[in-house]
Every structure is written in structure tokens, then in C-alpha cells.
Interface confidence: medium
Amino acid sequence: QPDAINAPVTCCYNFTNRKISVQRLASYRRITSSKCPKEAVIFKTIVAKEICADPKQKWVQDSMDHLDKQTQTPKT
């Protein structure tokens, strides 16, 4: 779970060790603050839970790509 040390900075100290299906993901945000010990991705799931994930893992990158495509406005 992400941990807010000093609002508004949220950091991740541990990453999930389970792949989350993209069908269970609603959105994500990147954690790049120098105040945090490591770079991270926080996924928000469809049941409103927030999960820390390692941005170096392929499934995390693929999931971010998938969510990016979902949120892009269709070109007309």
C-alpha cells in the first residue's frame, strides 16, 4: 500500500508480487519524487484500492500503455 509520509508526497516502499489483470485496473500515477526511496507506479483498481508496482516490470509497463490507450480521446 502507498504511504503518505508528508502530504502531498506519497511513496511506495514495497511492490506487489502479483500481476494485476488490466481488467481490474482503473488508472495509475507515477511516483518520481526525490523524497521517495524508489520510483514507483501506483495503480488504482476498480475496487478503489491503490497498489504499488515496480515500473521496471514488463506487466506494469504494458498495463500503463493499456490504460493510456483507454484514456486517449478517439480521433474523429
Epitope: R24, I46, V47, K49
Partner: antibody, heavy 119, light 108 residues
Framework: QVELVQSGAEVKKPGSSVKVSCKAS????????ISWVRQAPGQGLEWMGA????????HYAQKFQGRVTITADESTSTAYMELSSLRSEDTAVYYC????????????WGQGTLVTVSS | DIVLTQSPATLSLSPGERATLSCRAS???????LAWYQQKPGQAPRLLIY???SRATGVPARFSGSGSGTDFTLTISSLEPEDFAVYYC?????????FGQGTKVEIK
């Protein structure tokens, strides 16, 4: 340790309703979902539906749509399954089981409640 | 709905033998969101394997799961007397969740 304790056995008349409860202890109730699964005598497992209190989602199998209602009371960490218009084919053991809303495997199960529908 | 078909319906084996149970899905189970349960008479099912291949807490190493897409396997490397039971597969990626019809592992 997580424990799910279900209400006791019921004998019901055809056409009536039954409400089975499932009280959870040893975990954060609102962070998990509860599925209901039934098993007719000598038969396999049949998924009926699920509720995820955190998200407010409820899902039902088409077969039970309109006859089953799954609810949850976070204040008492209890989930309920009500099945109406009972018929003899509804005679079964009804189980509640916990799942993590992000994933979905059923990691803890209640002991089961036998519902007998007989005239 | 995803239909899960388990085979064989019954497996007659002796203690110490290897058991291989199959579960085939009518469509792909995305991200291998498939579980295996063991059920003994008069008891509730018990989770053995989740995400197709991860052992649940406290499950002996003789139980292993494999597979992806539409074909999944539960293997019991060497049957112990307490392993004779009914085994069910379960997909939890789509609603409605569905179970296979079960495979009974009985003593030969």
C-alpha cells in the same frame, strides 16, 4: 486468522424465501468481497453471485438473476444471501467465501448452510 | 459465460502415484486467473492453487498448477492418503465466475 461463520440449517416450503448470513472475523471486512456458492446433494460447485462492499459492486449469475439478493452490513461484518421463490431444486449446501477484490480466488470459506426445500 | 470442462471425471490411483487433472476453458482465461480447490466429503472446499500456478498458504509442495489461456493442469506428484477427494477448477477473471464440474480422485 480469518473465519466465516454461517447461520444454521433451514427447512423451507416451496415458494418461500431463505436468508443465509455469513459473519466474518479476523480481517478487514470492507477490503474484501464475498461470493456465494452452492452445492446440491452429490453435485458440483455452482457460483451464485458476489458482493464487494468497498466498491459497492454486486454481481449475479444469470440463472439466479431476479431471485437472489446479496447484501452486506459493514457495521457487523456480515454478508447475506437471500433466495426467493424456492423450489425443490434449490435444496443444497450454500457456502460463503471471501475473495480479494483485486484478484478473486476464494481463499476462506464458511462451513456451509444446508437449505432443504420440501413441502 | 466461460465453461470449464474438467477431465477425467474420475481418476482411480494408488497412494504414491502421480495424478494429473485437466481443466479446459471455453475461452481464454486472461492473466491465468484460475484456481484449484480440494473438497472432502462433508467439508467446505479448500483453496490449493491460485493464478494457475501459485500455491496457497500451507499447501504441500506435491501440489502444482500449470497452464495458461484455455488449458490448465493440476498435478499431485505423489498421492498421499489424504489427497483422495474431489478437485474443482474456478475462473475468476470474468463475471459470472464459473467452476468446472469436478474430478474425483479415488483409491484404486
Amino acid at each position: 486468522q480469518v473465519e466465516l461463520v454461517q447461520s444454521g440449517a433451514e427447512v423451507k416450503k416451496p415458494g418461500s424465501s431463505v436468508k443465509v448470513s455469513c459473519k466474518a472475523s479476523g480481517g478487514t471486512f470492507s477490503s474484501y468481497g464475498i461470493s456465494w456458492v452452492r452445492q446440491a446433494p452429490g453435485q458440483g460447485l455452482e457460483w451464485m453471485g458476489a458482493i464487494n462492499p468497498l466498491a459497492g459492486h454486486t454481481h449475479y449469475a444469470q440463472k439466479f438473476q431476479g431471485r437472489v439478493t446479496i447484501t452486506a452490513d459493514e457495521s457487523t461484518s456480515t454478508a447475506y444471501m437471500e433466495l426467493s421463490s424456492l423450489r425443490s431444486e434449490d435444496t443444497a449446501v450454500y457456502y460463503c467465501a471471501r475473495y480479494d477484490g483485486i484478484y478473486g480466488e476464494l481463499d476462506f470459506w464458511g462451513q456451509g448452510t444446508l437449505v432443504t426445500v420440501s413441502s | 459465460d466461460i465453461v470449464l470442462t474438467q477431465s477425467p471425471a474420475t481418476l482411480s490411483l494408488s497412494p504414491g502415484e502421480r495424478a494429473t487433472l485437466s481443466c479446459r476453458a471455453s475461452q481464454s482465461v486472461s492473466d491465468a486467473y484460475l484456481a484449484w480447490y480440494q473438497q472432502k466429503p462433508g467439508q467446505a472446499p479448500r483453496l490449493l492453487i491460485y493464478d494457475a500456478s501459485s500455491r496457497a498458504t500451507g499447501v504441500p509442495a506435491r501440489f502444482s498448477g500449470s497452464g495458461s489461456g484455455t488449458d490448465f493442469t493440476l498435478t499431485i506428484s505423489s498421492l498421499e492418503p489424504e489427497d483422495f477427494a474431489v478437485y474443482y477448477c474456478h475462473q475468476y477473471i470474468f463475471y459470472p465466475n464459473t467452476f468446472g464440474q469436478g474430478t474425483k480422485v479415488e483409491i484404486k
